[in-house]
Interface confidence: low
């Protein structure tokens, strides 16, 4: 009832609470001496659903038979109307649609460990959209019965408190659900089940792992578990994989021996129990154990690649590079990197250790055969030397590669060609392509690429440290015992004009024509491979177009001669740069005027 | 017309605790569900814990169970959530939603047509 109902009542047939798709028939009647003060007649008595009109009638009663109504719950306001003022309300009441609840489906029990307790959960089905209770039952050997009832709103799930213990783990015990609310009730199918069929283990704890002698080759994984396991799953994987490794044990007591191992790598151990081989369902997965292997002697063997650079008649600088250890081959934490360095001859050798670094720069004579040899270690042991001969890598011209060409192949990459040398190709054993930046001065601080490719390839595509807008000196190497031959490029992976021209420092005069030195571009103004250099000239005050001389880059040319001017005219002197991708804006502009004889 | 207003929100370290309160106005009949409903940038609003007016049956979402704890006051219209040993996992906007009805079933946000206006809960160190 809404309110007092002091004035009248609002009276529901058959019921407050109906079935979907049923009728309804509402009463509003007026109690005595409650209608209009002066004519009863013209009591008009109207029926509201939620703020909607839908029945009136004049006199002290009013009678509505309503359909349709929705899911849930409506609200019927009836109110009374008279003449010359406001609607006065008299009852109310809220009828509650529904249906009777579905079958509970999908009943299932579980007690989670030995020591827990039974809980059981199922599926309602579609919303009754009335109160519904739910009853849990269940019933065991020896006439013993227990039942819960449920008094949530979303009621899907019940404990019933009590524990199952293992004394007869055959015994069946069924349970039950049943639905009951104002328009019906309904049962779901029994599900019988032993201790064995619910009891789901705790996962397993105090999970640790041991390596006998620091081995990865002898390690063992320890847990505890609930008294009454007899299965075991262990998963385990490196902790930036997402595929898991997976072994099915019996009886494993709380130890398994893992063989398969990576050294120096962290992994993740997760076990799960099960009681019974065929009955009952696998534990949770334990906490995750993250350990890392013991480390193991170095695989493989340094790709290692050298520079020679000629100091004087009797001294050349050797610089020896080499690339890290992928983590499966270095097996460890590389301390240090030994060189070793012999004259074959003599036999003198020198052995150096090296840490935090990949290269390697000495000055040995120029005369004798050299070779070194390079290897890695860990706490456990060396990496097989890689050995070399240091050899002149361009002196065979008839193993130099042909017609070389480096073209850019999409964002920061260059496509290197090259043809096969003129000298017998199968003679060659692989070519090495290296790459570094053009830096003029030839700065050997300048880290180095490389990489090597098989004798029958003829193409190669560098990325790794290629930046755009830099301009790299690239050089093709076949290598066939020990000789070699080379050819170079200048080659970028994406180039725009250059944002400056060159400065122009000095203008000097030579037996009647001119000399012009310049300051190179900075190296992040050139915006790729310098083609050209310009120099344009032109009479001052003068309107006409100006002369020029276009001079192929050379990375060491900073200064050209021009012999065209005249003498005791003043011109004025400035000069661009070009990469393929075009000119360069002015550089500085100089005056200049010739002092020698005319002609 | 029903109305909602929360209040009670605020910033608390983790463990500590907070009450929630909701001033529920506009019913006409005992028939109704109170909800409390909690949303982050990004989810979806979760149900968090509600309560029938008429018999004051409850309920709460696993991840709440044990901490926190839904009450009415039917002489004051008020509906509380304390909030009790708080984590960061907690901090979120906290809305109290109603509707009529005799059932307790369904949590949907969408089954609820009245809502308040939220506060903002924040559980950090």
């Known amino acids: 009832k809404i309110d007092a109902c002091k004035r009248g009542d609002v009276t529901v047939k058959p019921s407050h609470v109906i079935l979907l798709g049923s009728t309804v028939n509402i009463t509003c009647s007026l109690k005595p001496r409650q209608g209009c003060f002066h004519y009863s007649r013209r009591n008009k008595l109207i029926l509201y659903k939620f703020d909607r009109r839908i029945n009136f009638h004049h006199g002290h009663s009013l009678n509505s038979q309503v359909t349709g109504l929705p899911l849930g719950t409506t609200l019927f306001v009836c109110k009374l109307a008279c003449i010359n003022s406001d609607e006065i309300q008299i009852c109310g009441a809220e009828i509650f649609v529904g249906v009777a609840p579905e079958q509970p489906q999908n009943l299932s029990c579980i007690q989670k460990g030995e020591q827990g307790t039974v809980a059981c959960t199922w599926e309602r089905g579609r919303d009754t959209h009335l109160y519904t209770e739910y009853t849990l039952q269940l019933s065991g050997p020896k006439n013993l019965t227990w039942q819960k009832q449920c008094k949530d709103i979303y009621c899907d799930y019940l404990d019933f408190g009590i524990n199952l213990t293992p004394e007869s783990p055959e015994s069946n015990f069924t349970a039950k659900v049943t639905a009951v609310n104002s328009l019906g009730s309904s049962s779901s199918l029994p599900s019988t089940f032993t201790f064995l069929d619910i009891v789901r283990p705790l996962p397993p704890w105090d999970i640790r792992i041991k390596f006998q002698k620091a081995s990865v080759s002898r390690c063992t994984l320890y847990w505890r578990d609930e008294g009454l396991v007899l299965l075991n799953r262990l998963r385990y994987r490196p902790s930036n994989s997402r595929l898991w490794n997976m072994v099915n044990v019996t009886k494993a007591k709380g130890r398994h021996d893992l063989l398969d191992l990576k050294p120096f790598t962290e992994y993740e151990f997760q076990i799960s129990s099960k009681l019974h081989l065929y009955k009952g369902s696998w534990s949770d997965w334990s906490e995750s154990l993250r350990a890392q292997t013991p480390e193991e002697e170095p695989t493989g063997m340094l790709d290692v690649w050298y520079m020679k650079r000629h100091i004087d008649y009797s001294r050349q600088q050797i610089s020896l590079f080499w690339k890290n250890l992928s983590v499966s081959e270095a097996r460890g934490k590389i301390l240090h990197y030994q060189v070793t360095l012999q004259e074959l001859t003599g036999g003198k050798a020198m052995t150096q250790n090296i840490t935090g670094h990949t290269s390697w720069t000495t000055v040995i004579p120029r005369t004798g055969n050299w070779a070194v040899a390079v290897s890695a270690a860990n706490s456990k042991g060396s990496s097989l030397p890689t050995r070399i001969n240091i050899m002149n890598l361009c002196e065979a011209g008839l193993l130099a590669p042909r017609q070389v060409s480096a073209n850019s192949e999409g964002m920061d990459n260059i496509l290197v060609t090259w043809q096969p040398p003129r000298k017998d190709p199968s003679a060659v054993q692989e070519y090495v392509v290296e790459w570094r930046e053009l830096h003029p001065g030839g700065d050997t601080q300048v880290p180095l690429n490389w990489l090597r490719s098989r004798p029958y390839n003829v193409s190669a595509l560098i990325s790794e440290n290629i930046k755009s807008y830099i301009c790299y000196e690239i050089r093709v190497y076949a290598l066939s015992g020990d000789q070699g031959g080379c050819s170079s490029i200048l080659g970028n992976s994406k180039h725009k004009a250059p944002l400056s021209g060159p400065h122009i420092n000095a203008i000097t005069e030579e037996k009647g024509s001119i000399l012009i030195s310049w300051n190179s571009i900075p190296v992040q103004e050139q915006m790729g491979c310098l083609l050209h250099y310009r120099i344009y000239w032109k009479e001052r005050d003068s309107n006409s177009q100006p002369q020029l001389c276009e001079i192929p880059y050379r990375v060491s040319q900073n200064s050209h001669p021009i012999n065209s001017l005249q003498p005791r005219v003043t011109y004025v002197l400035w000069m661009t740069a070009l990469t393929a991708a075009g000119e360069s804006s002015h550089g500085n502009e100089r005056e200049f005027c010739l002092q020698g004889k005319a002609n | 017309e029903v109305q909602l207003v929360e209040s009670g929100g605020g910033l608390v370290q983790p463990g500590g605790s907070l009450r929630l309160s909701c001033a529920v106005s506009g019913f006409t009949s005992d028939y109704y569900v109170i909800a409390w409903f909690r949303q982050t940038p990004g989810h979806e609003r979760e149900g968090v814990s509600s309560i029938r007016k008429g018999d004051g049956a409850t309920y709460y979402a696993d991840s709440v169970k044990g901490r926190f704890s839904i009450s009415r006051d039917n002489a004051k219209n008020m509906v509380y959530l304390q909030m009790n040993s708080l984590k960061p996992e907690d901090t979120a906007v906290y809305t109290c939603?109603?509707?009529?009805?005799?059932?307790?079933?369904?949590?949907?946000?969408?089954?609820?047509?009245?809502w308040g206006q939220g506060t903002q809960v924040t559980v950090s160190s």
């Open positions: 939603a109603a509707r009529y009805d005799t059932l307790l079933g369904g949590g949907r946000p969408r089954e609820f047509p009245y």
